[in-house]
Each structure stands twice: as C-alpha cells, then as structure tokens.
C-alpha cells in the first residue's frame, strides 16, 4: 500500500510535470501566435485511455516528436532548451510510471495537434493530482 510520504512524492512529481507541460503550452501560445501554424502541422498520438500513472507510457513515447516540434520555436519562449526540457520531463515520467511492469500503450484512432496533445496530458495530471489530495 502507498505510504503518505510516497503519495506526497508522487503528488510533487505530478505537479512538476504539470508545470512543465503548462510552460510548454504557454510558450507555444506566446510564439508570435500565427507562427504556431507551422507547429500545428505536426501530429501527435493520443492515449486511448489515460487514467493511471502507467498510462504515462503513452506520453513517454511522444516526447521525441514533442522535442522536434519545440525545436521550431524560438528559444526565448522557454527557460530551457527543448532537449533539456524534454529530458527533465522524461525523468519525471519514468519515475512516475515505474519500471516494474511493462505497459503497452494503446493509442486512439484520432491524432491531435500539439495544443490538443498538451491539453490532454495537462488534464491527466490535474485529474491524478485531485485523486491524491
């Protein structure tokens, strides 16, 4: 059973992940807005189901494409270089989803733009955080 300290740690990691994803979304939306149209040509795969920490496997698999899109953006919109930002997210995702069980991600049929993708994972983080508090 999860202890209060492990729950607290999970909550803090999720809050960190949430802040990173929100920072990316804000950076993109500040990106001379219509220049965003070039970033919207990239498509992202969405999880068929995202209700548990193990489903973060689906986010992990999309981090490389996310980094490629962020490389289109001007660095001044982010405090960190895309590579460092994605590396930080990857570390948190790996810790959160754990490595004990191998989970095969199932993707929905519909693909998404970078904005829809980020909003989906922001909602996921908020939902899990709310169950922990």
């Amino acid at each position: 059973a999860p202890t209060s300290s492990s729950t607290k740690k999970t909550q803090l990691q999720l809050e960190h992940l949430l802040l990173d994803l929100q920072m990316i979304l804000n950076g993109i939306n500040n990106y001379k807005n219509p220049k965003l149209t070039r970033m919207l040509t990239f498509k992202f795969y969405m999880p068929k189901k995202a209700t548990e920490l193990k489903h973060l496997q689906c986010l992990e698999e999309e981090l490389k494409p996310l980094e490629e899109v962020l490389n289109l953006a001007q660095s001044k919109n982010f405090h960190l270089r895309p590579r460092d930002l994605i590396s930080n997210i990857n570390v948190i995702v790996l810790e959160l989803k754990g490595s004990e069980t191998t989970f095969m991600c199932e993707y929905a049929d519909e693909t998404a733009t970078i904005v829809e993708f980020l909003n989906r994972w922001i909602t996921f983080c908020q939902s899990i955080i709310s169950t922990l508090t």
Epitope: T37, R38, T41, K43, E68
Partner: antibody, heavy 116, light 108 residues
Framework: QMQLVQSGAEVKKPGESLEISCEGS????????IGWVRQMPGKGLEWMGI????????RYSPSFQGQVTISADKSISTAYLQWSSLKASDTAVYYC?????????WGQGTLVTVSS | SYELTQPPSVSVSPGQTARITCSGD??????AYWYQQKSGQAPVMVIY???KRPPGIPERFSGSSSGTMATLTITGAQVEDEADYYC???????????FGGGTKLTVL
Amino acid sequence: QMQLVQSGAEVKKPGESLEISCEGSGYSFSTYWIGWVRQMPGKGLEWMGIIYPDDSDTRYSPSFQGQVTISADKSISTAYLQWSSLKASDTAVYYCARGGGPFDYWGQGTLVTVSS
Amino acid sequence: SYELTQPPSVSVSPGQTARITCSGDALPRKFAYWYQQKSGQAPVMVIYEDSKRPPGIPERFSGSSSGTMATLTITGAQVEDEADYYCYSTDSGGDVSVFGGGTKLTVL
C-alpha cells in the same frame, strides 16, 4: 473582409527583372505568414516559400532557393516576389496565399509570361 | 527534397464514391491538407488536419490518414466536384511545405 489582391499580368523578355506584389487587407498582415505558389501552364501547384512579415523570417523550397526573392513591407501590408533575371520557364500563374502551414486565403493569381 | 505522390487521374460516375490517395514518408507525423482547384480559379481547402472540414465544405468530402497514406473521399460525387485535387503537407522538419502532383477528378 479578408482579401489578398495581387498585381496585374506581366509580359517580359528573358533576362529582364520583375517584381509582383500581393496586398493583404482585413486582417493583421504582419502576424500571418504569406506564401507564394507557382502553377505553370497545365501543371500542378508548387510551393515556393513563405515569409513572416513582422520579422521577415523567410523559408524557401529547395527548388526555388536562389531563383527568386520573397520579401514583405509590413507598413503597407504587401508581400513581393522578385526575379533578377527571368527565363522562359518562369512563365506561370503565381498565387500568393496566407498561412504558414496550410494556406487558408488565396490571391487571384498573377500571370507572368516570359517570351522573346 | 520531400515528395507527395498522387494518382494523376480518378474517374467516377455521378453518385459514386471517389477516393484520391496521397503518399509521403512524413505523413505518419505530419497532417495532410487537401485543396480543390477548378479550372481558372484559385485553390480552395476542402480538408485540413487529415480529416477536418472547413466551414462551407459539403459533408460528402471527408479525409483520413493511416501510416504514410492520406485519402480524400468524396461520397456521392457530383458533377460540380470535377476539379483538380492536391494534397499538401510539410516535410519532417516542418520548415518546407509541398504539394502533391495533383489528381484530376472526372465525374461523368
């Protein structure tokens, strides 16, 4: 309403220079990419390149890099396509269009004829 | 340089379903867009982001994408749908865009 109005048809000789224009109205011209598309007689559409008027950030298709120059003057909401030395193979209809990814609005097209 | 490949022509009878394909190596990661161009006119977008229809485009136009192939489907093609259709996308880096070679749709 949103409009892109292009300059009129041109007839030129090989080796001459040319600049055609595209004036945008009904939207914030400086903060939308503007692109140019070539259509040779009886042929398909070819993406030439795009410019972001606010800072003149420009991207060219490898096929058109060095062959044409795309520029913009945001103070008069106008984009330009220039040739320094025309060739007969430049004969085509040239469209300007708004958008960095897909093009959502198009000009009426400018016919450029290059013939000796 | 990046290429999108389309069949040169597709013919259907009125009321039949027309399918126009577009293949490109980057399409698993890049959205496809479709333009209709009638003779002597500027192109008009009929599908964006693989499968979405802009306002004013009839419901008979639909789009899909799987792997390296995007498809424009016209269910119950009408005579007024006779036109050239172009797929459009960007290369894997997102910097350069490209049109397919175009498909002439004949509805007879």
